[in-house]
Interface confidence: medium
C-alpha cells in the first residue's frame, strides 16, 4: 500500500472548480506535514504550485495565481489542491508530495524523489 | 464478508442515557472511519457523528453535540455512541456506517447495519 | 454546514419512466456527492459515489451527473424495483449532510 494515493485522473468542464485529492496512508499523520503541490504539462519539467501546511503557514509558488489553493483534512488523512475557474492550460499531471514544515527548494526537491505518486487532472472541453 | 450489527437500541424515559454498540466484522476495522446516521420514524436520514480510522478526530452533528459520544476500540473491532440527556426528538432508527477505503478517493456510506431503534418516551 | 436541497420531494412515476431527481448544495462541494436508495424497514444503499460512478452492482439505468452545487441522479427506465426512497449526500467535509429524499411511487 502507497504511502500517499492519488485518483488517476480527473475531470471538469472550462470555469469550474475541482479538487484533487492527496490521501496519506493512515499509518501516518497529515497533521504533522505540509502538502506539496506540483504540475506537469506535456513536455515541460514539473513546477512547484503551493505549499500548505496551515491557513497561516503556506505559500504559494512564483506566478502562481491564486485560483490554485491549498487545504487539508486531518481527519481524513488529506490534502487537497482545489483549482477554481479551470482553463484549457490547466489539463495537466498534478503530483502531490508530503514533508517537513519547512518550504526550502531542497527538501521539495528530496521530497519529490520520495514521495510521490502522480494524480491527472484534465479538463473536459463542454 | 462485511457486515456491522448495532445493538444496544430499546426504550429509555426523557434524561436518561443508553450506550450503542456496533460489531464489525469481515475487514481490518482499525482502517476505516466509521459514521452514525439516524432515521427519525417516517423521515429522513440524519448524520450523527464519525470517527476516523484511528479515533484521533471526532465530529458530531449541532443537534447531539454535547450530548452524545462518539468512540472505538479497534482492538475489539467496535463503535460506540454514548448518548446522555436523551430527548423525545432523539428518536430514532441509528445505523452505524462504513466510509470506503482510504485509497477510494470518495467518502460514500459503502456498508451499513441494519439498525437499532431508540425510543425516547416518558 | 453544508445544506443540501432535494427536489422534488415526491415522485409518482410508472414502470418505464425516465426519472431525474434533482440535487443543490448550498456551497461548491466539487463532486464530493453520494446518492443512496432505501426501501421501507432497509438500510439505504450506496448507488452513485462521488457525483457520477456507479457503486458496484448497482444496474446501469442509474446514472448520476453534476459538480459545484447542482447534481442529478437519472433513472433512465423505471423498474418495478426501483420504487424507494432516495437520498443525496455531501462527504465534502464533516459534518456530512443528507438531503430530505425523494420518495419515488407508482403512478
Known amino acids: 500500500q502507497p504511502v500517499l494515493h492519488q485518483p488517476p485522473a480527473m475531470s471538469s468542464a472550462l470555469g469550474t472548480t475541482i479538487r484533487l485529492t492527496c490521501t496519506l496512508r493512515n499509518d501516518h499523520d497529515i497533521g504533522v506535514y505540509s502538502v506539496y503541490w506540483y504540475q506537469q504539462r506535456p513536455g515541460h519539467p514539473p513546477r512547484f504550485l503551493l505549499r500548505y501546511f496551515s491557513q497561516s503557514d503556506k505559500s504559494q509558488g512564483p506566478q502562481v495565481p491564486p485560483r490554485f489553493s491549498g487545504s487539508k483534512d486531518v481527519a481524513r488523512n488529506r490534502g487537497y489542491l482545489s483549482i477554481s475557474e479551470l482553463q484549457p492550460e490547466d489539463e495537466a499531471m498534478y503530483y502531490c508530495a508530503m514533508g517537513a514544515r519547512s518550504s526550502e527548494k531542497e527538501e521539495r526537491e528530496r521530497e519529490w524523489e520520495e514521495e510521490m505518486e502522480p494524480t491527472a487532472a484534465r479538463t473536459r472541453v463542454p | 464478508e462485511v457486515q456491522l450489527v448495532e445493538s444496544g437500541g430499546g426504550l429509555v424515559k426523557p434524561g436518561g442515557s443508553l450506550r450503542l454498540s456496533c460489531a464489525a466484522s469481515g475487514f481490518t476495522f482499525s482502517n476505516f472511519e466509521m459514521n452514525w446516521v439516524r432515521q427519525a420514524p417516517g423521515k429522513g436520514l440524519e448524520w450523527v457523528s464519525g470517527i476516523s480510522s484511528n479515533g484521533r478526530y471526532i465530529n458530531y452533528a449541532d443537534s447531539v453535540k454535547g450530548r452524545f459520544t462518539i468512540s472505538r476500540d479497534n482492538a475489539k473491532n467496535s463503535l460506540y455512541l454514548q448518548m446522555n440527556s436523551l430527548r423525545a426528538e432523539d428518536t430514532a432508527v441509528y445505523y452505524c456506517?462504513?466510509?470506503?477505503?482510504?485509497?477510494?478517493?470518495?467518502?460514500?456510506?459503502?456498508?451499513w447495519g441494519q439498525g437499532t431503534l431508540v425510543t425516547v418516551s416518558s | 454546514d453544508i445544506q443540501l436541497t432535494q427536489s422534488p420531494s415526491f415522485l409518482s412515476a410508472s414502470v418505464g419512466d425516465r426519472v431525474t431527481i434533482t440535487c443543490r448544495a448550498s456551497?461548491?462541494?466539487?463532486?464530493?456527492l453520494n446518492w443512496y436508495q432505501q426501501k421501507p424497514g432497509k438500510a439505504p444503499k450506496l448507488l452513485i459515489y462521488a457525483a457520477s460512478n456507479l457503486e458496484s452492482g448497482v444496474p446501469s439505468r442509474f446514472s448520476g451527473s453534476g459538480s459545484g452545487t447542482e447534481f442529478t441522479l437519472t433513472i433512465s427506465s423505471l423498474q418495478p424495483e426501483d420504487f424507494a426512497t432516495y437520498y443525496c449526500q455531501q462527504s465534502y467535509n464533516w459534518p456530512y449532510t443528507f438531503g430530505g429524499g425523494t420518495k419515488v411511487e407508482i403512478k
Open positions: 456506517a462504513r466510509v470506503v477505503d482510504f485509497d477510494q478517493d470518495y467518502n460514500g456510506f459503502d456498508y
Open positions: 456551497q461548491g462541494i466539487s463532486t464530493d
